[in-house]
């Protein structure tokens, strides 16, 4: 079974090692989730041809997946630590409903999908501790999330495969941008 960072023996401080700093812990969590996404993408690509589809074709979807934009302050030009941190947390909170959708979408990687979801929750908690400007963080409405989840689950098989692929690709891109931005702080 996949082990969350913080649960493995390497994270328990050995006699001569130092415990992880807050930045190291966050970095490790993001990398752990990205490794998980990589495994899930492998299963998705093996069972459908979505991975070969062009980006343009896949862009023609009505999913409102979180995405980094210049105004979010997470890129080199216009980098702003506080704005960026708020964007990362808000984005992760918005991804949670999509991660819930992924839970029954995998056969051989079911535990991996659960681990990605749980680790994202823990990552949000770590980042919320780091963020000073918590007022600006908006949490998605539970009722909105519930109806979105129902709508996604009602799609036909092809659309569900497409949705799964898009969620994983977008989440990977969002996390990689987050990782780079957090390392700059």
């Amino acid at each position: 079974a996949p082990v969350l960072p913080g649960e493995d023996s390497k994270d328990v401080a050995a006699p001569h090692s130092q415990p992880l700093t807050s930045s190291e812990r966050i970095d490790k969590h993001i990398r752990y989730i990205l490794d998980g996404i990589s495994a899930l993408r492998k299963e998705t690509c093996n069972r459908s041809n979505m991975c070969e589809s062009s980006k343009e074709a896949l862009a023609e979807n009505n999913l409102n997946l979180p995405k980094m934009a210049e105004k979010d302050g997470c890129f080199q030009s216009g980098f702003n630590e506080d704005t960026c941190l708020v964007k990362i947390i808000t984005g992760l909170l918005e991804f949670e409903v999509y991660l819930e959708y992924l839970q029954n979408r995998f056969e051989s990687s079911e535990e991996q999908a659960r681990a990605v979801q749980m680790s994202t929750k823990v990552l949000i908690q770590f980042l919320q501790k780091k963020a000073k400007n918590l007022d600006a963080i908006t949490t998605p409405e539970p009722t909105t999330n519930a109806s979105l989840l129902t709508k996604l689950q009602a799609q036909n098989q092809w659309l569900q495969d497409m949705t799964t692929h898009l969620i994983l690709r977008s989440f990977k891109e969002f996390l990689q941008s987050s990782l780079r931005a957090l390392r700059q702080m």
Epitope: T21, S23, E24, D27, K28, R31, L34, D35, S38, F75, Q76, F79, E81, Q176, R180, L182, R183, Q184, M185
Partner: antibody, heavy 117, light 107 residues
Framework: VKLQESGGGLVQPGGSRKLSCAAS????????MHWVRQAPEKGLEWVAY????????YYADTVKGRFTISRDNPKNTLFLQMTSLRSEDTAMYYC???????????WGQGTSVTVSS | DIQLTQSPASLSASVGETVTITCRAS??????LAWYQQKQGKSPQLLVY???TLADGVPSRFSGSGSGTQYSLKINSLQPEDFGSYYC?????????FGGGTKLEIK
């Protein structure tokens, strides 16, 4: 872009040394910075990294607890405080600027540190 | 820790030849990889980052590729100024280690 290291020299085992890196030609406070070293006739070894605001700091296991990376943004200077020095710390020490992806896009000329009695 | 294994350790080639240097990671480093060139007695210079993005001012005869754990640097039509040592480095998990290096010598 110019990076100029200083502070190297001969140090006794167990001793301390503080290296500096003066940056010019770019907005220093907008970039993460690295220290890298190279022992004589050996390969490159990453030593430490510091983010632009100093809240992200990483060290190589070989120097953790002995070396401290820091920066003074108003003075455009990067530092490496080295303590409990060992003979295996003998190397050319380079400071390097980090690009957005972590890679080192500009390097200084290096300052040589020799740990010997 | 992620280990990077570079091969070959040394290589002799002639001007005009094409050479490929490989870098194998002990785990998936998700393209968080850079390549550097270092000439004798000089500081290293960035060639490629993100596994395949050419750094500013680097000639187009250099190209990086790869994914997961396998990466390579290709130099087309070697020029006299290309001889020296080449290093890969990852930025996935700390420590951000370098490969052992590849010494490219003139034949």
């Amino acid at each position: 872009v110019k990076l100029q290291e200083s502070g190297g020299g001969l140090v006794q085992p167990g001793g301390s040394r503080k290296l500096s890196c003066a940056a010019s030609g770019f907005t220093f406070s907008r970039f993460g910075m690295h220290w890298v070293r190279q022992a004589p006739e050996k390969g490159l070894e990453w030593v430490a990294y510091i983010g632009r605001g100093s809240s992200t700091i990483y060290y190589a296991d070989t120097v953790k607890g002995r070396f401290t990376i820091s920066r003074d943004n108003p003075k455009n200077t990067l530092f490496l405080q080295m303590t409990s020095l060992r003979s295996e710390d003998t190397a050319m020490y380079y400071c390097a600027r980090s690009n957005w992806d972590g890679a080192m896009d500009y390097w200084g000329q290096g300052t040589s540190v020799t740990v010997s009695s | 820790d992620i280990q990077l294994t570079q091969s070959p350790a040394s290589l002799s080639a002639s001007v005009g030849e094409t050479v490929t240097i490989t870098c194998r990671a002990s785990g998936n480093i998700h393209n968080f990889l850079a390549w550097y060139q270092q000439k004798q007695g000089k500081s290293p210079q960035l060639l490629v980052y993100n596994a395949e993005t050419l750094a500013d001012g680097v000639p187009s005869r250099f190209s990086g590729s790869g994914s997961g754990t396998q990466y390579s640097l290709k130099i087309n039509s070697l020029q006299p100024e290309d001889f020296g040592s080449y290093y890969c480095q990852h930025f996935w998990s700390t420590p951000w280690t370098f490969g052992g290096g590849t010494k490219l010598e003139i034949k």
